[in-house]
């Protein structure tokens, strides 16, 4: 650690005195202190001498000697008082700049330690300090305002009692800066804009920050726009607003608009797109297939995306048949707005009944006209089967009718014994009918097919079974010949009640 001579913590001298402060260290040493007049600094080997032959009140201060090469960074200090009866204060700063909640040191140094008892801090022109100003005093350093607030940004003076009267220092301006958390906050409205050529438009770019020192500008396709700026201060924030007003838009006004704000912490930007169109438009689309197939009893949501400008004047869902004249319940229709010009309309169809198959149309209207988007909803059903014994052209024939959607496939089985359903061990013969006759096939209805199995003689201890299946399920009907005639037997589990 360097050593200062004279080896006293503080030195009191009169104005005009010669002061010599010597600092000695192991290596080179440096003096540090407030830049002030009349000092001479010179080196003598491993010592450095700070001297003046005409000390003034301005030389009052703490002088520190450091050894730059010392890794421990040791230092020694001496405080010099130049006791001037006419000048109780040496003010080391015109201005003090701190951030909010930091301690603010107002460097009024007493030139005479004896005056410490009668010091006080005031605002200029003798005004008292603001309420809740918490401060302390050190004769070496001055007044410290603890946890300074923005509102305490004022001009202050230090006061000392000399011979019963108060003597003021020159003023010190305290600037308490707001802590800037980051770049200014930005808003650009609207987020998207569409206008028909000739209409008016407005784009507003605004930025706000706790500190007034920030810049904001609006640019169109990378060209900075010259727009007058409106400034405001509310909710403890500074606001700067740029408003672009266009009375009659044209195609050259279209494009990308960016709102950019910057301060010492960095830059923020946000963008929007302005579209100029020739006339009103209304576009309907769906991400879904317009032809829908759903199993009976299940639910379905039909979704339509609408892109429109100007806004919609009306919209509704309509059931176009063919089963009934019922209309979708309004409570099942839902509308959500993605943004100003895009909306999604959903029709919820829970637990679909056979009478709800058919065409559903979404209609929308705006000044550009009407548009419609129609979905076709077909219900899927598992097959229903029935078998009868008949004679066709004199031949005994088993006739199987299967009804369902999609169109069922038909398989005949002959098995030993009397049973409700043939199992593998009993099967004697299997016939696939690849092309059953289609009896009815109307849109949105079940498809009914018929399959014929010509049987020369019915074996009485055997069962004939017609099985039908499609993507939804399967159904079967067992035919058991008995001496008194024929007996048909649909298995219980395949009875179907929608």
């Amino acid at each position: 650690i360097p050593v200062i001579e004279p080896s006293v913590p503080e030195l009191v001298v009169k104005p005009g005195a010669t002061v010599t402060l010597r600092c000695v260290g192991n290596g080179s040493v440096e003096w540090d202190g407030p830049p002030s007049p009349h000092w001479t600094l010179y080196s003598d080997g491993s010592s450095s001498i700070l001297s003046t032959n005409n000390a003034t009140f301005q030389n009052t201060g703490t002088y520190r000697c450091t050894e730059p090469g010392d890794p421990l960074g040791g230092s020694a200090a001496i405080h010099l008082y130049v006791k001037d009866p006419a000048r109780p204060w040496n003010v080391l700063a015109q201005e003090v700049v701190v951030f909010e909640d930091q301690d603010a040191l107002l460097p009024c140094l007493l030139t005479d330690p004896v005056l410490e008892a009668g010091v006080s801090l005031v605002r200029v022109r003798g005004r008292p300090l603001m309420r809740h100003t918490n401060y302390s005093f050190s004769p070496w350093h001055g007044f410290t305002i603890h946890r300074a607030k923005f509102i305490q940004s004022q001009d202050y003076q230090c006061s000392a009692l000399m011979g019963g009267r108060k003597v003021m220092s020159i003023s010190i301006r305290l600037k308490v800066q707001k802590v800037i958390p980051g770049p200014p906050a930005l808003t650009l409205v609207p987020a998207e804009l569409v206008r028909i050529r000739g209409e008016a438009a407005q784009i507003v770019c605004s930025a706000s920050s706790v500190d007034v020192n920030f810049d904001v500008f609006l640019q169109h396709n990378n060209t900075k726009l010259a727009i007058p700026q409106q400034s405001d201060f509310h909710n403890n924030r500074y606001q700067k607003v740029l408003t672009l007003n266009l009375d009659q838009v044209d195609f050259q006004h279209a494009g990308n608009y960016s709102c950019v704000a910057s301060n010492v912490q960095g830059k923020h930007s946000t963008s929007m797109f302005f579209r100029v169109v020739e006339s009103a438009y209304l576009n309907l689309s769906s991400e879904q297939n317009l032809i829908q197939e759903v199993t009976v009893g299940e639910g379905l949501n039909l979704k339509v995306m609408v892109e429109a400008y100007p806004g919609l004047q009306g919209f509704n869902w309509t059931y176009l048949g063919p089963f009934s004249d019922h209309q979708p319940e309004p409570k099942l229709a839902n509308a959500t707005t993605k943004d100003t010009y895009r909306h999604t309309f959903t029709l919820s169809l829970p637990r679909l009944k056979p009478s709800e198959a058919g065409r559903y149309s979404f209609l929308a209207r705006n000044p550009g006209g009407w548009r419609a988007l129609t979905f076709e909803l077909t219900l899927r059903y598992p097959p229903e089967v029935s078998v009868i014994w008949t004679f066709i052209n004199g031949s005994g024939t088993l006739l199987c009718a299967a009804s369902g959607y999609p169109q069922p496939n038909v398989t005949w089985l002959q098995c030993s014994g009397h049973t409700d359903r043939c199992d593998e061990a009993q099967v004697l013969q299997v016939w696939d009918d690849p092309y059953p006759e289609v009896l009815s096939q109307e849109p949105f209805h079940k498809v009914t097919v018929q399959s014929l199995l010509t049987v020369e003689t019915l074996e009485h201890n055997q069962t004939y079974e017609c099985r039908a299946h499609n993507s939804v399920g399967s159904g079967s009907w067992a035919f058991i010949p008995i001496s008194a005639g024929a007996h048909t037997h649909p298995p219980d589990e395949f009875l179907f009640t929608p």
């Epitope: 003096w31 002030s36 000092w39 930091q102």
Partner: antibody
Framework: QVQLQESGPGLVKPSETLSLTCTVS????????WSWIRQSPGKGLEWIGY???????NYNPSLKSRVTISVDTSKNQFSLKLSSVTAADTAVYYC???????????WGQGTLVTVSS | QSVLTQPPSASGTPGQRVTISCSGS????????VNWYQQLPGTAPKLLIY???QRPSGVPDRFSGSKSGTSASLAISGLQSEDEADYYC???????????FGGGTKLTVL
């Protein structure tokens, strides 16, 4: 060895605020006095102001109304703001460490700031 | 217009001794110490002399400073080509309460 590095925009528009930062390395900013000096072709070297780590500042009277120098000890940086700039503020701006006699022992390499629209 | 006055230019041949003058007033050089700076082309100024006649470590003893009344001078003996630079004087000014500079002298080594 103490090193100083200026940073900030090289071009500022008239009437706007010039903002520069000086980063100190190789030593703590929490001792010594720190300064901004500028050098313009027309006016030579001109002292702008001093700052101490506590935030105490002294400014050149000719610039006082437009200058703010602040310090951020946590980043070992001090900053200059010069408002309402004109073409006359075009200069190379230096940050430096001050001696108590008023001299400057260590300098940054300087940054040219041009004021132009 | 600089507060301290220096000749705009000076020149000398290698090996020669060159002196650069700096003139001020009672509020600066008259009552405070003088510093000299050397600025090589394209670089920042470097402290050459402080407190009238003190050399920082690393500055050759060819450079010396002196002060008398309200004037100061920088002497360079044994002039070398690498001494070609701008030289500035500076001093604390009591009325400004801060340092002032001279306008600079461009030294050319012929």
């Amino acid at each position: 060895q103490v090193q100083l590095q200026e940073s900030g925009p090289g071009l500022v528009k008239p009437s706007e605020t010039l903002s520069l930062t000086c980063t100190v390395s190789g030593g703590s900013i929490s001792s010594y006095y720190w300064s901004w000096i500028r050098q313009s072709p027309g006016k030579g070297l001109e002292w702008i102001g001093y700052i101490y780590y506590s935030g105490s500042t002294n400014y050149n009277p000719s610039l006082k109304s437009r200058v703010t120098i602040s310090v951020d000890t946590s980043k070992n940086q001090f900053s200059l703001k010069l408002s309402s700039v004109t073409a006359a503020d075009t200069a190379v701006y230096y940050c430096a460490r001050a001696l108590l006699t008023g001299g400057f022992a260590y300098w940054g390499q300087g940054t040219l700031v041009t004021v132009s629209s | 217009q600089s507060v301290l006055t220096q000749p705009p230019s000076a020149s000398g041949t290698p090996g020669q001794r060159v002196t650069i003058s700096c003139s001020g007033s009672s509020s600066n050089i008259g009552s405070n110490t003088v510093n000299w700076y050397q600025q090589l082309p394209g670089t920042a100024p470097k402290l050459l002399i402080y407190s009238n006649n003190q050399r920082p470590s690393g500055v050759p003893d060819r450079f010396s400073g002196s002060k008398s009344g309200t004037s100061a001078s920088l002497a360079i003996s044994g002039l070398q080509s690498e001494d070609e630079a701008d030289y500035y004087c500076a001093a604390w000014d009591d009325s400004l309460n801060g340092p002032v500079f001279g306008g600079g002298t461009k030294l050319t080594v012929l």
